[in-house]
Interface confidence: low
């Protein structure tokens, strides 16, 4: 079999809300992924499952079963949703990104992702991880790949 | 160390306004909220609202909106209460709390002496 | 707004007994970030109240362990093992889950 591909695009949308009562900040963190399918037969995408994290702390999991069908030499592009929560520990972000005197309140997050996909009854997993820039401040919508990011992409541990 | 100082009581005719003080001290006055606490004579607690001094932000509960109006002044480190169109549902003493040692945890574990407005004609 | 209804309104205790506090909330408190916020306060006669309990279970500083707190979701308890002199005065307990936040009524722990 030829290989499946799996890019990390980037951040496409994110979307911010405040609990001031808890110093609790929620991001709706959309990403788009393409997936390439480099074989002569269809490839079901079976999951994906994303996490991210911010300071080494997982902020927010999220996971898409049943999602598409890949025909062969097709490749089909995905957007995931990742809902997160900045709050306890790392409630000191609060005043960050609610702080009105700067006007793009930029942190890094360490997107993770997996994607299952199976043919014949065979499943593959491909990992990736990327180092990405979200502004906690606004709600944000970003041009496919131009997002910022930190080149850091390397398969997962 | 940690403390909020209140003003002293208050005597107010119906209809009139009053402005409490609550002045803080031994911590950074604006990175903690001020939370206003009302407590009826031989009655139980009511949460008034909060004002974060370092950006002057309120959240109000909406039952004493238009009633309390909070403030904070960071050079003298100290929050207001104003209470406005006074009648004697309003003679309470009135806290100002603070969660400084359990911000992430807790709301209330600083509390001011209390202030007693009294309103009478 | 969440209703907190405390039983029983009057506590009276020998020193040295077990009492316990009943809170119970018009709604489940859990906060959307997953934590309970409700906690227990203490006001003695002419005094501010003074924060027991917060997070339902844990003991704030300086708090004697005597002093615990449990449950969950709507259903709340404030025990006291063996009570002593300076715990009477009213408990309140109070969740800052759902704003409004809200107090209870308070219990009056006195001496029987």
């Known amino acids: 079999p030829r290989s499946i591909e799996v890019k990390y695009i980037g951040v496409k949308s994110a979307y911010v809300s405040y609990d001031a009562e808890k110093r609790t900040i929620y991001l709706n963190i959309t990403n788009t992924l393409n997936i390439t399918n480099n074989n002569y037969y269809s490839v079901e995408v079976e999951n994906i499952t994303a996490q991210v994290q911010f300071s080494k702390t997982v902020i927010g999991k999220a996971r898409l079963n049943n999602i598409t069908n890949i025909g062969p030499l097709d490749m089909k592009q995905i957007d995931y949703t990742v809902p997160t929560v900045i709050a306890e520990e790392m409630s000191y972000m609060y005043d960050f990104c609610t702080l009105l005197s700067i006007k793009v309140h930029n942190i890094v997050l360490m997107m993770q992702v997996t994607v299952t996909t199976a043919y014949f009854g065979h499943s593959e997993q491909i990992s990736q991880e990327r180092y990405q820039y979200v502004d906690c401040g606004r709600n944000t919508t970003y041009q496919l790949a131009q997002s910022e990011y930190l080149n850091v992409l390397q398969p997962q541990q | 160390q940690v403390q909020l100082q209140q003003s002293g009581p208050e005597l107010v005719k119906p209809g009139a306004s009053v402005k409490i003080s609550c002045k803080a001290s031994?911590?950074?006055?604006?990175?903690?909220?001020i939370h206003w606490v009302k407590q009826r004579p031989g009655q139980g607690l009511e949460w008034i609202g909060w004002?974060?001094?370092?950006?002057?932000?309120?959240n109000y509960n909406e039952k004493f909106k238009g009633k309390a109006t909070l403030t904070a002044d960071t050079s003298s480190s100290t929050a207001y209460m104003q209470l406005s169109s006074l009648t004697s549902e309003d003679s309470a003493v009135y806290y100002c709390?603070?969660?400084?040692?359990?911000?992430?945890?807790?709301?209330?574990?600083?509390w001011g002496t209390g202030t007693t407005v009294t309103v009478s004609s | 707004d969440v209703l907190m209804t405390q039983t029983p309104l009057s506590l009276p205790v020998s020193l040295g007994d077990h009492a316990s506090i009943s809170c119970r909330s018009g709604q489940s408190i859990v906060h959307s970030n997953g934590n309970t916020y409700l906690e227990w306060y203490l006001q003695k006669p002419g005094q501010s109240p003074k924060l027991l309990i917060y997070k339902v279970s844990n003991r704030f500083s300086g708090v004697p362990d005597r002093f615990s707190g449990s449950g969950s979701g709507t259903d709340f308890t404030l025990k006291i093992s063996r009570v002593e002199a300076e715990d009477l005065g009213i408990y309140y307990c109070?969740?800052?889950?759902?704003?409004?936040?809200?107090f209870g009524g308070g219990t009056k722990l006195e001496i029987k």
């Open positions: 004002i974060y001094p370092g950006n002057g932000i309120t």
């Open positions: 109070f969740q800052g889950s759902h704003v409004p936040w809200t």
């Open positions: 031994g911590y950074r006055f604006t990175s903690y909220y």
């Open positions: 709390a603070s969660p400084y040692y359990g911000i992430r945890n807790c709301y209330f574990d600083v």
